[in-house]
């Protein structure tokens, strides 16, 4: 988790002088509770936005937006703590809006936004906005949280972001898998424009089960430049294992930008349909 590399993060708006500060996620008001605290944020919204760094790289960011409730507690609102928690790693990053002037009621509802938390493809986050100061230990909570799922690199806009392109999102192998005679699969895919090797993983499963019954890896050496964007054809031999009929073919490239952690593409061959054979009717009825 990190912030987009903007030199000056701004939270000021007409009628409010405000500055964005790094935060330890442990606001001082936790340690020194105040008697009067503001109410919680209203209408917290998280959306996927995209932003360029100063170097021109494009990153997905969490666009966080919320409004204030129209009550007198805004007189005691000193700022907000924005927290983003990555759920699979428990990593947390916070920033603090520090209000340098008192809020006053005006004809429009106060609205705040922040779009500088860089998020990763295919990750889920919990976004929390805490109004400051935080409540006393038994006080009503004055925060709002929402979960936010970032699409993976298959998503059209995500595909062209720097992290997705670095992991090979622009490569479309267009995998085809064909069942041949004599327990063979013919796998065909389009090579990328890089002299790097690939590995094909064949995993076979019984019908309707997810425990594999056979697994085989096939290595494809780095193509020559004249083979870039050409189709590569590989014939894999299946093993005649009873019921081991569903096959997943997964292709992993080793591009220089993502090394051994590039996006993988897969295709599946289902078990052949079994014809419904009716129960044979006996031509006599046993008497016992």
């Amino acid at each position: 988790l990190r912030l987009l590399d903007h030199r000056a993060l701004v939270c000021s708006q007409p009628g409010l002088n405000c500055t964005v500060k790094n935060s330890t996620c442990l606001d001082d008001s936790w340690i020194h509770p105040r008697n009067l605290t503001p109410s919680s944020p209203k209408d917290l919204q998280i959306q996927l936005h995209f932003a360029h760094t100063q170097q021109g790289d494009l990153f997905p960011v969490a666009h966080i937006e919320w409004t204030l409730q129209t009550d007198a507690s805004i007189l005691y609102l000193e700022g907000a703590e924005l927290s983003v928690l990555q759920l699979n790693t428990n990593e947390r990053l916070c920033v603090r809006f520090e209000f340098l002037s008192k809020l006053r009621h005006h004809h429009r509802r106060w609205r705040f936004t922040f779009s500088h938390f860089v998020v990763d493809p295919d990750q889920e986050y919990e976004v929390t906005v805490h109004h400051l100061p935080k409540p006393i230990p038994d006080g009503d909570p004055n925060h709002q949280s929402k979960n936010f799922l970032v699409p993976d690199c298959e998503h059209a806009r995500m595909k062209v972001t720097t992290p997705c392109m670095s992991s090979g999102s622009l490569w479309d192998p267009n995998i085809t898998v064909e069942t041949l005679e004599a327990h063979q699969l013919r796998v065909s895919f389009t090579l990328w424009n890089e002299s790097t090797h690939y590995q094909i993983l064949l995993t076979s499963f019984p019908h309707m089960e997810n425990h594999s019954c056979f697994e085989h890896m096939h290595h494809i050496p780095a193509p020559r430049p004249e083979e870039f964007h050409q189709r590569s054809n590989v014939t894999l031999t299946l093993r005649n294992l009873k019921g081991c009929c569903r096959h997943q073919v997964q292709i992993q490239p080793f591009f220089s930008s993502c090394l051994n952690d590039c996006l993988r593409h897969s295709a599946t061959v289902s078990c052949p349909e079994m014809p419904d054979t009716p129960e044979p009717i006996p031509d006599y009825m046993p008497l016992w």
Epitope: Q199, L201, H211, S212, E215, H216, M217, Q252, D261, R264
Partner: nanobody, 113 residues
Framework: EVQLVESGGGLVQAGGSLRLSCAAS????????MAWYRQAPEKQRDFVAT???????TYATAVEGRFTISRDNAKNTVYLQMDSLKPEDTAVYYC???????WGQGTQVTVSS
């Protein structure tokens, strides 16, 4: 989550032998293909050998006839027996479980001439 731990690397003279081990945690090891890769300084990671779930093996051309990959499913371990070692075999050797794309931390093999 599968964890792979390699061991057995070291310094050996040209023509000598080493046996690398890769211990895997987690169940269903016997149904997994496994592989060895190696990475020399300033080079990309290269395929060395693979063994499928039935114990059938494939080797990179550079090591064919000198290296042998094997597995012991009872011990959840895959081995790489390296004979007739050459200075160009010097690299960090990595164990790989392709399905989950798990990698070990690597073990250094140095072959002196």
């Amino acid at each position: 989550e599968v964890q792979l731990v390699e061991s057995g690397g070291g310094l050996v003279q040209a023509g000598g032998s080493l046996r690398l081990s890769c211990a895997a945690s987690g169940s269903s090891f016997r149904f997994r293909a496994m592989a060895w890769y190696r990475q020399a300084p300033e080079k990309q990671r290269d395929f060395v050998a693979t063994i499928n779930s039935l114990g059938e093996t494939t080797y990179a051309t550079a090591v064919e006839g000198r290296f042998t990959i094997s597995r012991d499913n009872a011990k959840n371990t895959v081995y790489l027996q390296m004979d007739s070692l050459k200075p160009e075999d010097t690299a960090v050797y990595y164990c790989n479980e392709p399905r989950g794309n798990y990698w070990g931390q690597g073990t250094q093999v140095t072959v002196s001439s």
